[in-house]
Structures are given as structure tokens and as C-alpha cells.
């Protein structure tokens, strides 16, 4: 059980376009055809103005026009919904496809890609139907931009909603060695395939990826619950042979000062194929990027039933230590270390200011509205208070 980490099953709430909890001031665009098709008219199911946001420029052949939504705080965005222009039911403009870009700080923008590296998302086939896109992988973002596309010169218009939840972890990035490849009857790729930071010299830094996506790996690391993905997909792994130090070192950066109770590391323990829980974990703490590591490291030796080959969450007590940066060393106890998820149980230290983008206004943990129910291309069945967007259709 990954206590303290977000549950993807509860992270599918409408984030406030349709119900207007996202104010007009947080919706902007690269351009607008007219004031009646300005960015503020881009709310899903709204008929305001001329019924959508429509850019002034053509989106073909250049794809430079965008609609931007500022969520004001970091959110995990799990789905997006799009619609074309309403115009009293007479609108004919919609976008057959689009791209997404997102940012956590307003400075560095990342392009969203699916698990196979595809950036283009299938959009609408008509102006009125809502098309919901499950974002696999989800994105941790404060700002999201929609870039409509067209395959010829034509007018495109958009109405949108975002679905997800507040990113409570406060984790901004983790730094880790690049995951490696294990060779069995087939190659098992244990890289962090959704990492959105930088990779230089065998080190990934400045981003988030599969270790913070809410997806917990299975007992057999060759298997995944994701469709048509490669072996080892859910895990990031490292071989003992590549680390003469005997450990893998990772660093974690948070949004503000936090008192850390525990770290949860979901590990594989399929020792028949070389994967072992770490023999121990050692963590150091500091309050700022240029500061010294404070005090003695927290050390935790792992006990328990190490012979049980099932994957599991290992809890590492962190003793309430206060920090914004953690550096943890995971000691090898076998040929391979395989992690699928790392999360933290922590409390924000009062009066600590956020590291990104100025001060954020308060936001509720659960956004107010469930997903809309009148989707044309996907059947959605909100069940009571559950934020469930249920898609029925081909799993492919």
C-alpha cells in the first residue's frame, strides 16, 4: 500500500473550466479571432460569446496558436476534454487533433507525449461532441497549453476541460541515474520512459517521471498493466555491476520546506530474476539548493520477509526532519534494484514560501466538479462521489 501517495483512481475531477472555478483571468491565448471568441469563451459546454476560443491565425502549416489555462498550483492532470464551437448550435469549427504543452514554473515548457512518444492527440469529429483523452502518462503541471492542429488551411475553435487533482506531494523533481537494460529471454527496459527533465551523462535531473506517476509495478517486472508496452515498463532499475559504490543515489526537490515523516518506495523483489529489495536506505536533508546537508543522515536497514518474491512498498522513516531537498542512497542487496514508485509523507512547514512562481492562492484538495456526463465518444458514469470517468470501448 503506497500510503501518502495520490491514488490515480481519485484523481479525475474536473478542475474548473466548465464550472468556472478557474477564473477568466487564468485563461489566455496566443491570439483570438475576435473578442467574442476570446480565450475566456473556451469553457467546455459553455455557449458564451460566439461559443469557443478561436485563434486569429491559421494553425496550418505552423502550429503556434495556443489556449493556456493557469491552474495556479501544481496539479496532476489525468485527462483533458475538448469540444468545438457552439454558436447556438450553428458552429462548424472544431479541431481534429491537437498537442499539449505544460509547465510547472511558467519558464520551462514540456511537450506532452504518450507512452510511445506520440505528441498528437486525436480531437473532435464535430463541433458539439466532447472527446475525452486519458493522458497516459499524466502530467504534473501548473500551466497547460492546447495547440490545435489542422491538415489544411481552415478555422479551428476549442472548448476545453482538464481533469485531475491537486499535486499534494509537493515533489518538483527527482534526480537519478538513467535506468538500465536487463537481458533475459528478451531485453527488459528499466529506463524512466516518461521522465520530463534533462538527461546528461547518464544522469536525469530537473523532472518527474514514472517514479511519481501513481502506477505501481506488478510482482513480475516483465509484466505491465499498460497495453502494448515493452518489458519492464513500470519499473526503473539499476544493476549492481554499474555502481562500484554499492548504492544508487537519488535527490528529491520539493516545492517548499516540509517535515518528512516517511518515504515510501515501491520495489520489486523477484529474486529469481535478480531483483532484490534494497538492503538499506540512507537519507540526508537540506533546506536550500546551495546549503550544506544538515545533521546526521537517517539510516534504515530493511528487515522483513526478504524471501517473499512479491513486489511491495517499503516504508523508510524520516523522523520529521525538515528540508526542501533530500538525497537518498539505496543500497544493493542483490544484482538489481527495481523501483516503480517513490512517494513521501510530509507536512508543509508553516510560513514556508513556495519555490515556484510566486505565492499561490489557496486551492481545495478536491476540485469541486465531477466530469461531465454527456460525452459523445466515451461513456462516462460518475458514481456518487467517485470522480470516475469510465471509458467504454476498445482497449487499443
Amino acid at each position: 500500500d503506497m500510503k501518502g501517495h495520490f491514488d490515480p483512481a481519485k484523481c479525475r475531477y474536473a478542475l474548473g473550466m466548465q464550472d468556472r472555478t478557474i477564473p477568466d483571468s487564468d485563461i489566455s491565448a496566443s491570439s483570438s479571432w475576435s473578442d467574442s471568441t476570446a480565450a475566456r469563451h473556451s469553457r467546455l459546454e459553455s455557449s458564451d460569446g460566439d461559443g469557443a476560443w478561436c485563434p486569429a491565425g491559421s494553425v496550418f502549416p505552423k502550429e503556434e496558436e495556443y489556449l493556456q489555462v493557469d491552474l495556479q498550483r501544481l496539479h496532476l492532470v489525468a485527462l483533458v476534454g475538448t469540444q468545438g464551437r457552439h454558436a447556438g448550435g450553428l458552429g462548424k469549427e472544431f479541431s481534429r487533433s491537437y498537442r499539449l504543452r505544460y509547465s510547472r514554473d511558467g519558464r520551462r515548457w514540456m511537450g506532452w507525449k504518450d507512452r510511445w512518444g506520440q505528441e498528437v492527440i486525436s480531437g473532435n469529429e464535430d463541433p458539439e461532441g466532447v472527446v475525452l483523452k486519458d493522458l497516459g502518462p499524466p502530467m504534473v503541471a501548473r500551466l497547460v497549453r492546447f495547440y490545435p492542429r489542422a491538415d489544411r488551411v481552415m478555422s479551428v475553435c476549442l472548448r476545453v476541460e482538464l481533469y485531475g487533482c491537486l499535486w499534494r506531494d509537493g515533489l518538483l523533481s527527482y534526480t537519478a541515474p538513467v535506468g538500465q537494460t536487463m537481458y533475459l529471454s528478451e531485453a527488459v527496459y528499466l529506463n524512466d520512459s516518461t521522465y520530463d527533465g534533462h538527461t546528461v551523462g547518464g544522469l536525469q535531473y530537473g523532472g518527474l517521471g514514472q517514479l511519481a506517476d501513481g502506477v505501481v509495478g506488478l510482482d513480475d517486472f516483465r509484466k505491465s498493466q499498460e497495453l502494448r508496452v515493452w518489458p519492464g515498463y513500470d519499473y526503473v532499475g539499476w544493476s549492481n555491476h554499474s555502481f562500484s559504490s554499492g548504492y544508487v543515489e537519488m535527490e528529491f526537490e520539493f516545492d517548499r520546506l516540509r517535515a518528512f515523516q516517511a518515504m515510501q518506495v515501491h520495489c520489486n523483489n523477484m529474486h529469481t530474476l535478480g531483483a532484490r529489495l534494497p538492503g538499506g536506505v540512507e537519507c540526508r536533508f537540506r533546506r536550500g539548493p546551495a546549503m550544506a546537508w544538515e545533521g546526521e543522515p537517517m539510516r534504515h536497514n530493511l528487515g522483513g520477509n526478504l524471501g517473499d518474491p512479491r513486489a511491495r512498498a517499503v516504508s523508510v522513516p524520516l523522523g520529521g526532519r525538515v528540508a526542501r531537498f533530500l538525497q537518498c542512497r539505496f543500497l544493493f542487496a542483490g544484482p538489481w534494484l527495481l523501483f516503480s514508485e517513490i512517494s513521501f509523507i510530509s507536512d508543509v512547514v508553516n510560513n514556508s514560501s513556495p519555490a515556484l512562481g510566486g505565492t499561490f492562492p489557496p486551492a481545495p484538495w478536491w476540485p469541486p466538479g465531477p466530469p461531465p456526463t454527456n460525452f459523445s465518444s466515451l461513456e462516462l458514469e460518475p458514481r456518487g462521489q467517485q470522480p470516475v470517468a469510465k471509458a467504454e470501448g476498445s482497449p487499443t
Partner: antibody, heavy 119, light 111 residues
Framework: EVQLVESGGGLVQPGGSLKFSCAAS????????MSWVRQTPDKRLELVAI????????YYPDSVKGRFTISRDNAKNTLYLQMSSLKSEDTAIYYC????????????WGQGTSVTVSS | DIVLTQSPASLAVSLGQRATISCRAS??????????MHWYQQKVGQPPKLLIF???NIESGIPARFSGSGSRTDFTLTINSVEADDVATYYC?????????FGGGTKLEIK
Amino acid sequence: EVQLVESGGGLVQPGGSLKFSCAASGFTFSSYGMSWVRQTPDKRLELVAIINSHGFSTYYPDSVKGRFTISRDNAKNTLYLQMSSLKSEDTAIYYCARGGYGNYGMDYWGQGTSVTVSS
Amino acid sequence: DIVLTQSPASLAVSLGQRATISCRASESVDSYGNSFMHWYQQKVGQPPKLLIFRASNIESGIPARFSGSGSRTDFTLTINSVEADDVATYYCQQSNEAPYTFGGGTKLEIK
């Protein structure tokens, strides 16, 4: 030890309804997609419903679409299959299986529960 | 729909000999460099049991005499040194494209 135990089969008339359940134990149920697979009297296997680990996504082949509904309760470690408008060609042994959504097939199966649709 | 054709429909092999079962798909079951073809064993009165996943990976607990190979449309399940306990019907299944389909089965008997 992984265990999947189905219940709820029986004899039903054409046009009738039936609901199965499958109690899972020995693994983290909420981490796995689940399926219902049926085996017809001529021993052919047909996957009739899949649900992903969180229960958001479901899939049905055309032969049962609109008549069968797969669901799950992760708090109770239980998978369900609601069948309605039953036809004689739905007569089969119905197996609950772990997997289906995923990249590895179905790695554990229950013992099956028998359904006979006949007047 | 992808149609899986297994051959032979039945097979009689002497103890200790090799058994080879073929599964041919009507279109490729490969995606992103992987073959999404799986093999199951079903003994009389029992549910199917996963033997091989993604064409060549032996499921945990399955004896090493079972192996799988192939790609795109042509796949083979091989049982080296058949034992009496291997008497069963063997099915292939693809999970590359919905609807996920099974082959018609190959019945293995001891000669």
C-alpha cells in the same frame, strides 16, 4: 497464493439475467486489470469483458456489447459480471482471470462457473 | 478481427520426444518491437494456465522444457522432452488488437 473464486452460475431462460462475482485473494487486486473469459461447449475460448485496474476503462466484444457489464470493487477485492438478455449461445463456462488489460495475457484463472441458457 | 489458426488440431507424441505446436495470425500481432502472443495449457476439468507470454517469456513456475518463439504472424510453442503430465489442450492468444482472440486449440496426447 493467488486465488480467484467465481460464484453465481446456473440455469437461466433466454432473455433472463444473471450476475457473477469473483472473489480475489493473494495479490494486490487494485493493481491488476481483470477479465471474464468464457469457454463454449465446443471448447472455444472467448474473452467477453475486460476492466482496467481502477475500473475506469472497460471493453466488450460485439457479441456481448450492451448486454454484459463488467465492474469491480477494489475495497472488497471482487470482480463482477452482470449479464442480461441472455441467449442460448451464451451457454458456457465463465472464468474470471487476472490480466487482459496489460502486456502479458491472463496469468491466473478461477475454476469457472457454468451457465446454461435454455427454456 | 485477428484470426488465430493453430496446427495441428491434435498431436500424439512419445514420452521424451519433442512436441511443436504452430499458431498463425491473420495479421501481425507485433507492436513497438514486441509480439503480443501468449500460450496457455488447459488440462481436462481445469481452467487454462499461462505458459508463455509475449511469444517467448516463460511464466514463473513453468518448467523450462516449455519454450515459445516467433514474431509478427508465425509463432511456435515447443515442449522439449514431453512428459505424461503435459497431456492437455494448448491455446494461443493475441492481445495486440481488440477483440483479443484465441486459437482453436491443439490437443496433445501421448503416443
